[in-house]
């Protein structure tokens, strides 16, 4: 069955619900664009999208706001060219993970830099921006295969959808196992894991819609205990 989506005329500052924009789109809504914050994941899918598209229509404000939305959607960006920087939230998330892992006091946290401390990741990963041209298809939340649309309509044309993907580095040191794991007691493996982001897609019945799709988002260490010899 087609998934539940919403119509137009919501407003939430961002061009598309929970999707960052970059480059040419920034000025579409004037200087105040982006001031309202992200739309809620619970909010209906298209509440924001057509505000930018419908020059002719007045909109009603979107009152919902959910900070968790950032974490899910920071890996998607609409842009006229390849984004130059990783998602800001991704960088913040990485830094937070370093701090949490170190379990330092608040006073130390403020002044310590993981890179200077020589910390190493348990699994080596690589991250890059990819387009729908690279992805072609993806799996949606219902397990169906959908086509990821390369272009997304905006008021002055179309922008490309970019996805910030993170996966295990096949050329890295940890391809044989996780770093720092006692090999006498544990079998370890670095595995790419996926999570859901919202993207404009088309299903097998040629129906275009905003759907959650799976993309590679991290490289994690999986352990199994070695049986006694």
């Amino acid at each position: 069955a087609p998934m539940k989506e919403a119509n137009i005329r919501g407003q939430g500052g961002l061009a598309y619900p929970g999707v960052r924009t970059h480059g040419t789109l920034e000025s579409v809504n004037g200087p105040k664009a982006g001031s309202r914050g992200l739309t809620s994941l619970a909010d209906t899918f298209e509440h924001v999208i057509e505000e930018l598209l419908d020059e002719d229509q007045k909109v009603r404000p979107n009152e919902e706001n959910n900070k968790d939305a950032d974490l899910y959607t920071s890996r998607v960006m609409l842009s006229s060219q390849v984004p130059l920087e990783p998602p800001l939230l991704f960088l913040l998330e990485e830094y937070k993970n370093y701090l949490d892992a170190a379990n330092m006091s608040m006073r130390v946290r403020r002044h310590s830099d993981p890179a200077r401390r020589g910390e190493l990741s348990v699994c080596d990963s690589i991250s890059e921006w990819v387009t729908a041209a690279d992805k072609k298809t993806a799996v949606d939340m219902s397990g169906g295969t959908v086509t990821v649309l390369e272009k997304v309509p905006v008021s002055k044309g179309q922008l490309k959808q970019y996805f910030y993907e993170t996966k295990c580095n096949p050329m890295g040191y940890t391809k044989e196992g996780c770093r720092g794991i006692d090999k006498r007691h544990w079998n370890s493996q670095c595995r790419t894991t996926q999570s859901y982001v919202r993207a404009l897609t088309m299903d097998s019945k040629k129906r275009i819609g905003w759907r959650f799709i799976r993309i590679d988002t991290s490289c994690v260490c999986t352990l199994t205990i070695k049986r006694g010899r």
Epitope: K4, E5, E46, L53, V154, S155, L200, K206, I208
Partner: antibody
Framework: EVQLLESGGGLVQPGGSLRLSCAAS????????MSWVRQAPGKGLEWVAG?????????YYADSVKGRFTISRDNSKNTLYLQMNSLRAEDTAVYYC?????????????WGQGTTVTVSS | EIVLTQSPATLSVSPGDRATLSCRAS??????LAWYQQKPGQPPSLLIY???TRATDIPDRFSGSGSGTEFTLTISSLQSEDFAVYYC??????????FGGGTKVEIK
């Protein structure tokens, strides 16, 4: 104000052909799904055909017109078309073009004034 | 194909009174229902979408409600300009996009 203006209607004999046009203005035509809807004299609304914006020629038809009607669009001219072949008396109606949304799951928020097609011998 | 059944076919109401129009879908449509108003010689115009959201510039005397398969359009206090034909339409599962048969709201 957003506008849709249909043209091309008229009187045609059964078995004949007509091509309807719908000119769009004041919105980014190429971004939207578009549809044709008809209304026979004294009757209700009947959806005829739709087309998405994706450029791959993805079209959708009511069973009653499949194989006889063809919907198309020329984004460079901001124009929607309906080629009607093998016309029948029951195709007599006012034909409206309507704008939908970016995705498949949207109502028709802008309608044209309509053009009348009469199929009669 | 999703069939929409509107009732009543005709509703006779006095100006200032409340009018309640019903639309029943043959299967669930996840709230993807619109209401249109059509006056003689004019195209339809969008009143309500997503079952309950008023379209641009629609007065608040018009309200939509319902979910699943049962939907209602309520006009709280009928004005002279509200006497018209009202259609519901589903846009959840298509093709085909389907409309209800219409309800004519006439002056009592």
């Amino acid at each position: 104000e957003v506008q849709l203006l249909e043209s091309g209607g008229g009187l045609v004999q059964p078995g004949g052909s007509l091509r309807l046009s719908c000119a769009a203005s004041v919105f980014t035509f190429s971004n939207y799904y578009m549809s044709w809807v008809r209304q026979a004299p004294g009757k209700g609304l009947e959806w005829v055909a739709g087309i998405n914006w994706n450029g791959a020629g993805d079209t959708y038809y009511a069973d009653s017109v499949k194989g006889r009607f063809t919907i198309s669009r020329d984004n460079s001219k901001n124009t929607l078309y309906l080629q009607m072949n093998s016309l029948r008396a029951e195709d007599t109606a006012v034909y409206y073009c309507a704008k939908q949304g970016v995705t498949h799951y949207n109502p028709m928020d802008v309608w044209g004034q309509g053009t009348t097609v009469t199929v009669s011998s | 194909e999703i069939v929409l059944t509107q009732s009543p076919a005709t509703l006779s109401v006095s100006p200032g009174d409340r009018a309640t129009l019903s639309c029943r879908a043959s299967q669930g449509i996840a709230g993807k229902l619109a209401w249109y108003q059509q006056k003689p010689g004019q195209p339809p115009s969008l009143l309500i979408y997503d079952a309950s959201t008023r379209a641009t510039d629609i007065p608040d005397r018009f309200s939509g409600s319902g979910s699943g398969t049962e939907f209602t359009l309520t006009i709280s206090s009928l004005q002279s300009e509200d006497f018209a034909v009202y259609y519901c339409q589903q846009y959840y599962d298509w093709p085909p996009l389907t409309f209800g048969g219409g309800t004519k709201v006439e002056i009592k």
